[in-house]
């Protein structure tokens, strides 16, 4: 049950990213750290970098509400038990500032890519009976 809910939440984050991609022109065109080709065991660290990034609505009015709600939902913190190997490897993972900075469109695309990778890994670990999530 908990594992299923975890997967639903991760997929939900992809849906939120997809919704925000519809509004890239309404986001502040700021360059944000956007992890790519994240090394194994640093996925949760990179995930945390995406969540910390200051993605913001440009307050143009029309879609401000849905953008702000979506950004806030993107920052929902998973329980630490879901961080898998994060604790063990945190010290060896790149800092958020070390990742290449990208505008909102590419930032969201890279976030989606990471989420997809994490979902794939999660499913694989379940298939192979691993404890990691």
């Amino acid at each position: 049950q908990g594992q299923d809910r975890h997967m639903i939440r991760m997929r939900q984050l992809i849906d939120i990213v997809d919704q925000l991609k519809n509004y890239v022109n309404d986001l502040v065109p700021e360059f944000l750290p956007a992890p790519e080709d994240v090394e194994t065991n640093c996925e949760w660290s990179a995930f945390s970098c995406f969540q910390k990034a200051q993605l913001k609505s440009a307050n143009t009015g029309n879609n401000e509400r849905i953008i702000n709600v979506s950004i806030k939902k993107l920052k929902r913190k998973p329980p630490s038990t879901n961080a898998g190997r994060r604790q063990k490897h945190r010290l060896t993972c790149p800092s958020c500032d070390s990742y290449e900075k990208k505008p909102p469109k590419e930032f969201l695309e890279r976030f989606k890519s990471l989420l997809q990778k994490m979902i794939h890994q999660h499913l694989s670990s379940r298939t192979h009976g691993s404890e990691d999530s």
Epitope: R9, Q12, D15, I16, D18, Q19, N22, P79
Partner: antibody
Framework: QVQLVESGGGVVQPGRSLRLSCAAS????????MHWVRQAPGKGLEWVAF????????YYADSVKGRFTISRDNSKNTLYLQMNSLRAEDTAVYYC???????????????????WGQGTTVTVSS | EIVLTQSPGTLSLSPGERATLSCRAS???????LAWYQQKPGQAPRLLIY???TRATGIPDRFSGSGSGTDFTLTISRLEPEDFAVYYC???????FGQGTKVEIK
């Protein structure tokens, strides 16, 4: 069982104020965002306001912005709608509704309003 | 702000028939953000479908939702007497409702 009960409706003159309450029971109120939705006589549904589960963010429909204030008291499991400078066009049945997306990672995940109260009627008339 | 346009305004059908309700958005909506509600006279609305196609708890399987982008559909495969009501689509996050489709007995 999961329940929302609104109160505080009534007849009020234009320009006056009214405060609606919504008592929640049967669920962890502090884990859910909450909405007010209204329905004028013979009309469709109109979203009015939303408050985040912890009260940290509030959103309003343009038609009520600056006049209505949504708030909550998680210790009392109660949602409020303070309505000031009331107008004839505010006449409606007011519903409180639970947002189906829980703040809990393992909680409910519905992007919709999954629990509704029975509604309380507000009539603005001189 | 997004506008949701429902059609038809009224659908006159007989019990046992299939009902197809449309909801068109003025800009693209992620499927996760589209919900459908049912409202009967004198009652509060009830969540039917969330995520464009997932039935809410306790909703019979004769109700189904589909669509993506700007076009969404609610289908009632065989109308039961209790299904005659008004149906609303909604975009989550902006919480905008469509104007509603009334399904009435022919």
């Amino acid at each position: 069982q999961v329940q929302l009960v609104e109160s505080g409706g009534g007849v009020v003159q234009p320009g006056r104020s009214l405060r609606l309450s919504c008592a929640a029971s049967g669920f962890t109120f502090s884990s859910y965002g909450m909405h007010w939705v209204r329905q004028a006589p013979g009309k469709g549904l109109e979203w009015v306001a939303f408050i985040w589960y912890d009260g940290s963010d509030k959103y309003y429909a343009d038609s009520v912005k600056g006049r209505f204030t949504i708030s909550r008291d998680n210790s009392k499991n109660t949602l409020y709608l303070q309505m000031n400078s009331l107008r004839a066009e505010d006449t409606a049945v007011y519903y409180c509704a639970r947002d189906g997306d829980s703040s809990d990672w393992y909680g409910d995940y519905y992007f919709g309003m999954d629990v509704w109260g029975q509604g309380t009627t507000v009539t603005v008339s001189s | 702000e997004i506008v949701l346009t429902q059609s038809p305004g009224t659908l006159s059908l007989s019990p046992g028939e299939r009902a197809t309700l449309s909801c068109r958005a003025s800009q693209s909506v992620s499927s996760s953000y589209l919900a459908w509600y049912q409202q009967k006279p004198g009652q509060a609305p009830r969540l039917l479908i969330y995520g464009a196609s997932t039935r809410a708890t306790g909703i019979p399987d004769r109700f189904s939702g589909s669509g993506s982008g700007t076009d969404f559909t609610l289908t009632i495969s065989r109308l039961e007497p209790e299904d005659f009501a008004v149906y609303y689509c909604q975009q989550y996050g902006s919480w905008t409702f469509g104007q509603g489709t009334k399904v009435e007995i022919k």
